[in-house]
C-alpha cells in the first residue's frame, strides 16, 4: 500500500467560451481508495477555489458553469490525489478559455452540382456555423475545412475554405458518388468533429475540360 501516483490534467474543452470542462488522468492508486480534488485560482489572485462541479463532465472531470467561467483571465489549476498513505499533486495547468474552444460541427451542409452554360461545371458546397457560436460579437473567427471522396475511395481530398461558408470544387470524377463533410475551428482552439456526410452523385456528363 502506497500513496497515490501523480495525476495529470490532460484536456480542457469549451463549446463556446461560456462554460468549460477539464479532465485528469489518475496516477497509480497505491492499492487504496483515492479521493481527487481539483483546485484553481485565477491569475493575479491568491485565493484558491475548489472545482464547482465534479459531476457534469463525467469521471475525473471538473466542469465550470457560466458563473465560474471568465474569458479574459488565465486559470491555474491542479489536482490533488489523496489516500490513507498520503497525497500527490499534478503539475499546475494554465488554461485560457479563449484557447480551448471546440465547437460543434457546422450545420445545414448542402451540396449541389452546378453546370452553367458559359463556364466549367463545379460542385457547390454550402453550410452554416454551429448554433452555439455567436459570430456577431466578433469574439469568434471560425475557419472551415471540407473533405470529400468518391464513395469507394480510401483517401479524402481536403480543401481549406478559410472563413467563407461556401466553396466551389472543379475537379471531380464524372459518374461517381461523392461523400462530402465539413468541420470548423476557432482562430485559437480545436477542430470540431466532421459534420454528418452528405452524398452527391456526379453526372456522367460532368466534364472537367
Amino acid at each position: 500500500q502506497l500513496p497515490p501516483g501523480k495525476p495529470e490534467i490532460f484536456k480542457c474543452r469549451s463549446p463556446n467560451k461560456e462554460t468549460f470542462t477539464c479532465w485528469w488522468r489518475p496516477g497509480t492508486d497505491g492499492g487504496l481508495p483515492t479521493n481527487y480534488s481539483l483546485t484553481y485560482h485565477r491569475e493575479g489572485e491568491t485565493l484558491m477555489h475548489e472545482c464547482p462541479d465534479y459531476i457534469t463532465g463525467g469521471p475525473n472531470s471538473c466542469h465550470f458553469g457560466k458563473q465560474y467561467t471568465s474569458m479574459w483571465r488565465t486559470y491555474i489549476m491542479m489536482v490533488n490525489a489523496t489516500n490513507q498513505m498520503g497525497s500527490s499533486f499534478s503539475d499546475e495547468l494554465y488554461v485560457d478559455v479563449t484557447y480551448i474552444v471546440q465547437p460543434d460541427p457546422p450545420l445545414e451542409l448542402a451540396v449541389e452540382v452546378k453546370q452553367p452554360e458559359d463556364r466549367k461545371p463545379y460542385l457547390w458546397i454550402k453550410w452554416s456555423p454551429p448554433t452555439l457560436i455567436d459570430l456577431k460579437t466578433g469574439w469568434f473567427t471560425l475557419l472551415y475545412e471540407i473533405r470529400l471522396k468518391p464513395e469507394k475511395a480510401a483517401e479524402w481530398e481536403i480543401h481549406f475554405a478559410g472563413q467563407q461558408t461556401e466553396f466551389k470544387i472543379l475537379s471531380l470524377h464524372p459518374g461517381q458518388k461523392y461523400l462530402v463533410q465539413v468541420r470548423c475551428k476557432p482562430d485559437h482552439g480545436y477542430w470540431s468533429a466532421w459534420s454528418p456526410a452528405t452524398f452527391i452523385q456526379i453526372p456522367s456528363d460532368f466534364t472537367m475540360n
Partner: antibody, heavy 120, light 107 residues
Framework: EVQLVQSGAEVKKPGSSVKVSCKAS????????MHWVRQAPGQGLEWIGE????????NYNQKFKDRATLTVDKSTSTAYMELSSLRSEDTAVYYC?????????????WGQGTLVTVSS | EIVMTQSPATLSVSPGERATLSCKAS??????VAWYQQKPGQAPRLLIY???NRYTGIPARFSGSGSGTEFTLTISSLQSEDFAVYYC?????????FGGGTKVEIK
C-alpha cells in the same frame, strides 16, 4: 518530470536540408502546442513556427513558410522541424519549446538546443 | 511584424542592487508579453507571462509591469545567479517576436 530532448548537432552543406527532432516525456504530448525557436551565434531569439500535436495543425513565421516543415509522431511523442535550402545564415541553435499552458504562446519548457552549422 | 526593442543593451549592476529592464513594442500588444532569462550555453527560462505574472517557482524578486507598448522587468535585489541575458517576447499577433535582449552584468 517534463523533458524535451533534442537530436544532436548537425553539419550541413548549403542547399541541403536538416531535420531536428524533439522527444517529449513527462506529460501528455497531444495536450500542448510545440514551438520551434532559433538563435544564431551571439544573437537573439527568432520564432520559426508552432504545431498542435493533437491534429498537426501548424502556423509559421512567414519568413520560414516556404522552407520549414513542422511534423509530429504521436506514437513516439516526438516533434520534428525540417529546414530546407539551407544557407550559411541558418547556422544557429534550434530549440523546441512547449507552450506554457492551454492558452497563449509563452514557453515554459525548452529543449537543450541543437546546433546546426551550415558550411561548404 | 511587431518589433520588440529592449534597452539598455547592457546593464552593469552590483549584487544586491535593483535592476530595471525596458522593452517597447512597435504596436499595441495589451499584456501579451513574457520575459525569459538565458545563461550562456543554456536554453531560455520563463520568468513572467501576461506582462506581470510570475511563472511557477520564480522568486519574488522578479516582477513585471506595463501594458500597451511599454513593459518593464525589475529584479529587486540582484543575486549572483541573476547575471544573464533577459529577453521579452510578445504573443499578441503572429509572428511571435522577441526583443534583442539585455545583458545584466556584474559591475
Amino acid at each position: 518530470e517534463v523533458q524535451l530532448v533534442q537530436s544532436g548537432a548537425e553539419v550541413k552543406k548549403p542547399g541541403s536540408s536538416v531535420k531536428v527532432s524533439c522527444k517529449a516525456s513527462g506529460y501528455t504530448f497531444t495536450t500542448y502546442w510545440m514551438h520551434w525557436v532559433r538563435q544564431a551565434p551571439g544573437q537573439g531569439l527568432e520564432w520559426i513556427g508552432e504545431i498542435d500535436p493533437s491534429d498537426s495543425y501548424s502556423n509559421y513565421n512567414q519568413k520560414f513558410k516556404d522552407r520549414a516543415t513542422l511534423t509530429v509522431d504521436k506514437s513516439t511523442s516526438t516533434a520534428y522541424m525540417e529546414l530546407s535550402s539551407l544557407r550559411s545564415e541558418d547556422t544557429a541553435v534550434y530549440y523546441c519549446a512547449r507552450n506554457g499552458g492551454l492558452g497563449p504562446a509563452w514557453f515554459s519548457y525548452w529543449g537543450q538546443g541543437t546546433l546546426v552549422t551550415v558550411s561548404s | 511584424e511587431i518589433v520588440m526593442t529592449q534597452s539598455p543593451a547592457t546593464l552593469s549592476v552590483s549584487p544586491g542592487e535593483r535592476a530595471t529592464l525596458s522593452c517597447k513594442a512597435s504596436q499595441y500588444v495589451g499584456t501579451a508579453v513574457a520575459w525569459y532569462q538565458q545563461k550562456p550555453g543554456q536554453a531560455p527560462r520563463l520568468l513572467i507571462y501576461s506582462a506581470s505574472n510570475r511563472y511557477t517557482g520564480i522568486p519574488a524578486r522578479f516582477s513585471g509591469s506595463g501594458s500597451g507598448t511599454e513593459f518593464t522587468l525589475t529584479i529587486s535585489s540582484l543575486q549572483s545567479e541573476d547575471f544573464a541575458v533577459y529577453y521579452c517576447q510578445q504573443y499578441s499577433s503572429y509572428p511571435w517576436t522577441f526583443g534583442g535582449g539585455t545583458k545584466v552584468e556584474i559591475k
